[in-house]
Interface confidence: low
């Protein structure tokens, strides 16, 4: 991260896989060193420390201090360290949820994957990529949101009832686009504006439902930064 640069924010959905991107610009003369590159990912949680003591005796490089008496908030700790020979070390309970793509690493992509991401994973992440005597770094802030779809009125509906479906993700900015769809067999059928379906931002209004409307309804929220989330809701209409 160069001085003056903003720390990028990466959004992820709780319970879904999350990618923490890190593809630093590798000088051409160092490309041959990628096979032997080491990477250390550090995490400073946003709030209360996850269980287990920070640091790991096997992790190469410095270990952060335990959060006991120093600092009013959790300390940074090593999430995962991969040495030149592929030797891994890290800290439970994140493993084995934490993964690096080995093939990606040889292409200069040191992204960290959380499979799945949990609320406690929110916070600042820093990666140090070590190439011989050179260290490149990535820095980002992971924010986690919850996705939900609610129906108003809730519960089972009768034929000719109306319903409003609201698709939401706990993120402060509005989605750039909202797409509604229905699952039919193996495919998705887009829901378009019609006398039966009224679309307004993240809301879908069905003025008169019928038993044919029973089944899964879905929406995809896409944000300006490219993050998207898919949410499903099972509608029940009684004949």
């Amino acid at each position: 991260l160069q001085p003056g640069a903003e720390v990028p924010v990466v959004w992820a959905q709780e319970g879904a896989p999350a990618q923490l991107p890190c593809s630093p610009t590798i000088p051409l003369q160092d490309l041959s060193l990628l096979r032997r590159a080491g990477v250390t990912w550090q995490h400073q949680p946003d709030s209360g420390p996850p269980a287990a003591a920070p640091g790991h005796p096997l992790a190469p490089g410095p270990h952060p201090a335990a959060p006991s008496s120093w600092g009013p908030r959790p300390r940074r700790y090593t999430v995962l360290s991969v040495g030149p020979g592929g030797l891994r070390s890290g800290r439970l309970p994140l493993q084995p949820r934490v993964q690096l793509d080995e093939r990606g690493r040889q292409r200069g992509d040191f992204s960290l994957w959380l499979r799945p991401a949990r609320r406690a994973d929110a916070g600042e992440y820093r990666a140090a990529v070590h190439l011989r005597d050179r260290a490149l770094s990535c820095r980002l802030r992971l924010r986690l949101g919850q996705a939900s779809m609610t129906a108003s009125p809730p519960g089972s509906l009768r034929a000719s009832d109306w319903v409003i479906l609201n698709c939401s993700f706990s993120r402060p900015d509005r989605p750039a686009s909202v797409h509604w769809f229905r699952n039919r067999g193996q495919g998705r059928v887009p829901v378009r504006e019609s006398p039966h379906h009224h679309l307004a931002e993240s809301f879908l209004f069905l003025p008169q439902v019928s038993p044919m409307d029973s089944g899964p309804w879905g929406c995809i929220l896409t944000y300006r930064d490219g993050f998207n989330v898919s949410i499903m809701y099972n509608l029940t209409v009684l004949g």
């Epitope: 001085p3 250390t40 490089g61 410095p62 201090a65 009013p72 908030r73 940074r76 770094s137």
Partner: antibody, heavy 121, light 107 residues
């Protein structure tokens, strides 16, 4: 670019207090905590404490507890360090220092220009 | 607190010479040692962190090594602008502590 600009030199009498400011620019102020480190004339460095700029919560080194207060003003991206009950041995250059580009805490890649505080009767 | 003992306290050298400064920690600090350069009336500049990693923009003549308790800082070929005081610092845990400094002087 990333910059920390400190307030000017101060001359104080023993027993008085001094408040030094450190204004950050070139980055998002709340993304990096701020440390205060002092250097007595011809001496090495002594870490005084850290303030987490997002929450405003400080942590002080044992030797300064009860005498130092660190605060921040996010509206002006400024951190303050106040040292009370000054004595002659507090004569030093006081630096604010951030770990802006660090991978770990506790080393400092961005420093203010320093503020000389002289305590003399 | 972890004590950092730096030696020598001063060193006279000439342009082009190779210079080595050592730092000893009072306990194991893994590879968590940084090195700074300070010129009179100026703030310190970070040169090396994590014992051996050069900070952005630092010339390759500056290098560091070591782990555990013994650390070395080397300038492979001293340049005129390198005459300054150098400090080691452990960043293993809080409170961060510094060595007393090594003043590099022109012979």
């Amino acid at each position: 670019q990333v910059q920390l600009v400190q307030s000017g030199a101060e001359v104080k009498k023993p027993g008085a207090s001094v408040k030094v400011s450190c204004k950050a620019s070139g980055y998002t102020f709340t993304e990096s905590p701020m440390n205060w480190v002092r250097q007595a004339p011809g001496q090495g460095f002594e870490w005084m404490g850290i303030i987490y700029t997002d929450t405003g919560e400080p942590t002080y080194a044992e030797e300064f507890k009860g005498r130092v207060t660190m605060t921040r003003d996010t509206s002006t991206s400024t951190v303050y360090m106040e040292l009370s009950s000054l004595r002659s041995e507090d004569t030093a250059v006081y630096f604010c220092a951030s770990d802006y580009g660090s991978i770990l805490y506790w080393y400092f890649d961005v420093w203010g220009q320093g503020t000389l505080v002289t305590v003399s009767s | 607190d972890i004590q950092m003992t730096q030696s020598p306290s001063s060193l006279s050298t000439s342009v082009g010479d190779r210079v080595t400064i050592t730092c000893k920690a009072s306990q194991d600090v893994s590879t968590a040692v940084a090195w700074y350069q300070q010129k009179p009336g100026k703030s310190p500049k970070l040169l090396i962190y994590s014992a051996s990693y050069r900070y952005t923009g630092v010339p390759s003549r500056f290098s560091g090594s070591g782990s555990g308790t013994d650390f070395t800082f080397t300038i492979s070929s001293v340049q005129p602008e390198d005459f300054a005081t150098y400090y080691c610092q452990q960043h293993y845990n809080a409170p961060p502590t510094f060595g007393q400094g090594t003043k590099l002087e022109i012979k």
